[in-house]
């Protein structure tokens, strides 16, 4: 498992050529985990979905998602997390023309179908913590974050910088 | 509702060809990995090849691998399976299967069979 | 090639509990799927991932997997549950199922 420290060099080398905010960055397939190992697994139907959040059985293939790296136009207030000063924002896909969304209302993190561009909801600011490890910050709603609730996905509010460090807002993103 | 139909099933002399179709409706067919599964006459369930995207994920049993060929046609909702140098031993009734969940970037197929249609009988004899 | 195995029949009285086993070398790595098939129709999923259940199956199906071995457990059987059932797994993109279980409502 790994930061973003990778593709942060990835994509300084694409910085100059690329469009803010419009066309991403860089897009990387890798498998999404949380901090205690258990594996992300999306099981989508057309009219219904489930993400589960286990221990994967030894035989079986980690799901990948696509992540599209994003610089955000607005400079990033902390340093780590951003390429030349910018912060970086991911949305994230685990099949074609589907992406996360933050429902703030519900708290919860779904799955929707929707042509580009992309609304807010599907954005996420991207934080390179500890451990390898990141987290995923909701861009419309600032201090809430993608975590684990009851071995589901869900939106965690984080009240204070010590608490985002707490295990069940970090991640680990895995090539295999 | 989602609908699997199978045609294409006959008589064929041993050697010979033939290609099944599975005209899929009621989902969104692009986004599934498909499967064939076949069953002799009072035998058990056999799988024999499995499709991902278009044509660089494809599957094949040992027994049928270099004689069938799966492909699909997302423009027209439809699975084949084209079987040449056909042997007594490929008799049964062919199922088209779909696989219960869409396909995740990791590729491949994404078991289980979560839906099937109503079979189309394949008999090679002379 | 991988090999699941599976009991030829099973009995079992109306109202009673049917298991069915499937084994196959380390099983419990692997996620189990069960099928049943009446006489005359195409095979219907009825346990997926070990214990999950399609919509539209009865909670009267359950399922279970570790070790070497996964169950399909009938509680409660019914004249309709008469049937051949078939395990299966995935391995590496190839699809295996058991030789079938004819199950018997006496």
């Known amino acids: 498992a790994f930061g973003i420290s990778g593709v942060q060099k990835y994509t300084r080398a694409l910085h100059d050529s690329s469009i803010t905010g419009i066309s991403p960055i860089t897009e990387y397939l890798a498998s999404l985990s949380t901090y205690n190992d258990q594996s992300i697994t999306f099981a989508l139907e057309d009219e219904s979905y489930e993400i589960y959040v286990e221990d994967l059985k030894k035989d079986e293939k980690k799901d990948k998602v696509l992540l599209s790296y994003y610089e955000s136009q607005h400079p990033s207030n902390e340093s780590g997390d951003g390429v030349d000063g910018k912060m970086l924002m991911v949305t994230l896909s685990p099949t074609k023309d589907f992406w996360l969304h933050a429902n703030n209302k519900e708290h919860s993190v779904e799955l929707h179908k929707c042509e580009k561009p992309l609304p807010d909801q599907a954005f996420f600011v991207l934080h390179n913590m500890h451990s390898n490890c990141v987290s995923f910050e909701c861009k419309t709603d600032p201090g809430v974050f993608i975590g684990v609730k009851d071995n589901h996905l869900a939106l965690i509010k984080v009240d204070s910088s010590e608490n985002l460090c707490t295990e069940n807002i970090l991640f680990k993103l895995s090539e295999t | 509702e989602v609908q699997l139909l199978e045609s294409g099933g006959g008589l064929v002399q041993p050697g010979g060809s033939l290609r099944l179709s599975c005209a899929a409706s009621?989902?969104?067919?692009?986004?599934?990995?498909m499967s064939w599964v076949r069953q002799a006459p009072g035998k058990g369930l056999e799988w024999v090849s499995g499709i991902a995207d278009d044509f660089t994920s494809t599957y094949y049993a040992d027994p049928v691998k270099g004689r069938f060929t799966i492909s699909r046609d997302n423009s027209k909702n439809t699975l084949y399976l084209q079987m040449n140098s056909l042997r007594a031993e490929d008799t049964a009734v062919y199922y088209c299967?779909?696989?219960?969940?869409?396909?995740?970037?990791?590729?491949?197929?994404?078991?289980?069979?979560?839906?099937w249609g109503q079979g189309t009988m394949v008999t090679v004899s002379s | 090639s991988y090999v699941l195995t599976q009991p030829p029949s099973v009995s079992v009285s109306p109202g009673q509990t049917a298991s069915i086993t499937c084994s196959g070398e380390?099983?419990?790595?692997?996620?189990a799927a069960w099928y049943q098939q009446k006489p005359g129709q195409s095979p219907v999923l009825v346990i997926y991932?070990?214990?999950k259940r399609p919509s539209g199956i009865p909670e009267r199906f359950s399922g279970s997997n570790s070790g070497n071995t996964a169950t399909l457990t009938i509680s409660g059987t019914q004249a309709m549950d008469e049937a051949d059932y078939y395990c299966?797994?995935?391995?590496?993109?190839?699809?295996?199922f058991g030789g079938g279980t004819k199950v018997t409502v006496l």
């Open positions: 009621g989902f969104t067919f692009s986004s599934y990995a």
């Open positions: 299966g797994v995935l391995k590496q993109d190839t699809g295996v």
């Open positions: 991932r070990d214990t």
């Open positions: 299967a779909r696989d219960l969940w869409m396909m995740n970037y990791a590729g491949g197929l994404r078991y289980p069979f979560g839906y």
């Open positions: 380390r099983m419990g790595d692997k996620y």
